[in-house]
Interface confidence: low
Amino acid sequence: YSHWPSCCPSKGQDTSEELLRWSTVPVPPLEPARPNRHPESCRASEDGPLNSRAISPWRYELDRDLNRLPQDLYHARCLCPHCVSLQTGSHMDPRGNSELLYHNQTVFYRRPCHGEKGTHKGYCLERRLYRVSLACVCVRPRVMG
Amino acid sequence: YSHWPSCCPSKGQDTSEELLRWSTVPVPPLEPARPNRHPESCRASEDGPLNSRAISPWRYELDRDLNRLPQDLYHARCLCPHCVSLQTGSHMDPRGNSELLYHNQTVFYRRPCHGEKGTHKGYCLERRLYRVSLACVCVRPRVMG
C-alpha cells in the first residue's frame, strides 16, 4: 500500500491509517487459490476452490483504486446465467438462475482537505458505501404475479 | 454502538474510531429481509430474499460482541446438508453439497492499554482476523483420489 496523509493529527496518523488499511480484506476464499484450468468456463469442477466447484460458478475480478481504502476489492462475476447440472457439471438448467449475492461494504476515499479560507490541508478520508458482489448463488427464479 | 476510548491521541480519537466503526458492515442481503414463513426449513422458496430462494438455503445468525468492532457480525448457517431440487424446491439431491463460503474478516478487539509502569491508560484496539461465513453455496462434491 502507498502511504497516505490523513486528517487525523500527525501523532495519530499511523494508528488511524493502519486500522483503516486492515479493516477490510479481499474476499477470495480461504482455500489456496490454485489456478483454475478453465477459469472462464461455465462448468462446475470436481476439485479446486469453492467458486469453481459451485453449480453457480464465479470468478473474482480485482477492483483496484489507489485513492480508496481498501485499495483492492474483489467482485464475484458469475460464469453462467443459469445453474449447472450436478450430474454432468456442464449442462445448464434454465430452471435455476445464477444470481450475485451483494454486500454494501464501507470504503474510504481520499479527498483533498481544505483548511481555513480554502487552503489545501492534505487529504481527508470520506466514507462511502460501496456495493461488492461476494459470490454467485443458484436460486429458484422469483414467481411473478 | 457504545463509545470506546482509543489509543489514538484524543484529538484524533473520533476520526480513528468513526472510521473503524464504519469500516465493516453486516453481511445480510440488500433485499428487504422479509420474515420467512419457514425460516428453518430445508426448502428453496420461489420468493423472498436470496438466502431463502437459494437451492443451498441459509439463515443468518447474529454474533454480537460489545468488545469488538464491528460489534455485530452475521454468520450464514446452511439449512440443508445437500442441495435442493430446482424442480420441487424441497427434495434434496445428494449429488450436491451445500457448503459454507468463508471469509477472513479483520475485526478489532478492545483491550486495556497500559502506560508507563503498567498504569491503565484506557482501551486499545487489537486487530484480529475473524472467520465469517458469508453464504451457502451448492457445489459438486470433491473427487477424492
Epitope: Q87, T88, P94 | T88
Partner: antibody, heavy 121, light 107 residues
Framework: EVQLVESGAEVKKPGASVKVSCKAS????????MNWVRQAPGQRLEWMGL????????SYNQNFKGRVTLTVDTSASTAYLELNSLRSEDTGVYYC???????????????WGQGTLVTVS | DIQMTQSPSSLSASVGDRVTITCSAS??????LNWYQQKPGKVPKLLIY???SLHSGVPSRFSGSGSGTDFTLTISSLQPEDVATYYC?????????FGQGTKLEIK
Amino acid sequence: EVQLVESGAEVKKPGASVKVSCKASGYSFSGYTMNWVRQAPGQRLEWMGLINPYNGGTSYNQNFKGRVTLTVDTSASTAYLELNSLRSEDTGVYYCAREDFDSWTFFAMDYWGQGTLVTVS
Amino acid sequence: DIQMTQSPSSLSASVGDRVTITCSASQGIASFLNWYQQKPGKVPKLLIYYTSSLHSGVPSRFSGSGSGTDFTLTISSLQPEDVATYYCQQYSSFPYTFGQGTKLEIK
C-alpha cells in the same frame, strides 16, 4: 402399474366453477409433481400449472389470470384442479399428467389421466 | 412466454417414408424440449424427452435432434400406427408451452 384416474365429465354455466380430481396409484404420489393440461376442441395443448404434492408448492400459467387453483390430498393420493369464473372458451378436455424428472436435465409428462371433458354453456 | 411453432401443420406420407417434423422456439431453450404423440381420440403420450432421449417403449424409428431454437422429430420409416398429431413442448421456463401440433396422415 402407474395410473391416473380423473373424475367424470362436467357441464357448467358461465361464471360457475369446476373442480376436477385425479387419483394416482402405482407410485409414490409425493415424489412427483403433477401437471394439468387443457385441450380445447381443435386447439393445441395448453399447460395450466403444476403442484408438488410433497410441499404443496405450485407454479401457475399466468394466462389463466388467477382463475386456477391446484391442490392435493396426499392421504388420498389425489390432485385437484379448480377453475373459476368459467366462460365458453374454457370448454375442453382437462388432463392431469405426472411429471418425471432427474432434477437437472429432463422434466417430462410421462403418465397422463384419461381426461375430463368440461363443457361450459 | 416462449412461443413454439411447428411445421408443417399437417402432412401426408406413405408407409415406409422418412418423415420430418420441425419445431421452432421463439428464444433459446437449450435442449429442454419434449415430443408427444396423440392418436385420434386418445390421450397424449410421451415420445421423446430432452430433445433426443427415447421414452421407454417407443420404437427406435423415432428420433429427435436439435438445440437452441430449432428441433426436429424424425420417423425413419413411417408405419400405419404412427397416424397421430405430434406436439413439441418446451420446459426451459414457466409457463410450459406446446407447439400447435402436426397432424400426420397416411397417403
